[in-house]
Interface confidence: medium
Amino acid sequence: YDFTNCDFEKIKAAYLSTISKDLITYMSGTKSTEFNNTVSCSNRPHCLTEIQSLTFNPTAGCASLAKEMFAMKTKAALAIWCPGYSETQINATQAMKKRRKRKVTTNKCLEQVSQLQGLWRRFNRPLLKQQ
């Protein structure tokens, strides 16, 4: 999906008001310094691409993020503020239902959510030069 035509300010507002809290709640008890940010993004569409990938695509050691509160709110924000996004997700959602696993918070998931926090921070600061 091409995120170029999303309403970035509306997505940012959704992040600042709710998604950020849910990410903090998920990471509660984990020091942010435990993980190095290895995933980066260069502009807002790129950031949303990376955020979608880390949030919804199962990875080795972390298959369960899509059912977390921050993920559901991220999905809702993208569906509302990115034209045509919902349609592209129908097949992906059906595939996910077939391989649903019980929620387990692993260290790998914590690391992944730490990366997500960094991507969201970058999304919110589009005028900053890339580090």
Epitope: L16, S20, I24, G29, S32, R125
Partner: nanobody, 127 residues
């Protein structure tokens, strides 16, 4: 649940002082590299950033309008950030909010991104 609760506001005469507190629950300031800041919104005006403290190195930032009068500090053992406000002026009258997940050094204090999580605390400066 993740929450921020602001307190310490009230009615004070011009030239007086107040200390605002921002207490976090549901998460620990010290565990994150989020910066924490204070904002205010006066009746009929836009929200504006007042001050910010970096959770990485303790660096502090102030809006020009409060420099030399306000001091931001934090106490990680109490999970609280404070705003000491001295030499208060009528134009400081506003609802004061604190917020996390902001970025002290990006665009200047006045241009923070933020969304209030708490109800804020009202500061009224009047004789």
């Amino acid at each position: 649940e993740v929450q921020l609760v602001e307190s310490g506001g009230g009615l004070v005469q011009p030239g007086g002082s107040l200390r605002l507190s921002c207490a976090a629950s549901g998460f620990t300031f010290a565990d994150y590299d989020y910066d924490i800041g204070w904002f205010r919104q006066a009746p009929g005006k836009e929200r504006e950033g007042v001050s910010c403290i970096s959770n990485r190195d303790g660096s502090t930032y102030y809006a020009d309008s409060v420099k030399g009068r306000f001091t931001i500090s934090r106490d990680n053992s109490k999970n609280t950030v404070y705003l000491q406000m001295n030499s208060l002026r009528p134009e400081d009258t506003a609802v004061y909010y604190c917020a996390v997940e902001i970025h002290c050094d990006d665009y200047g204090v006045e241009n923070f991104d933020f969304d209030p999580w708490g109800q804020g605390t009202l500061v009224t400066v009047s004789s």
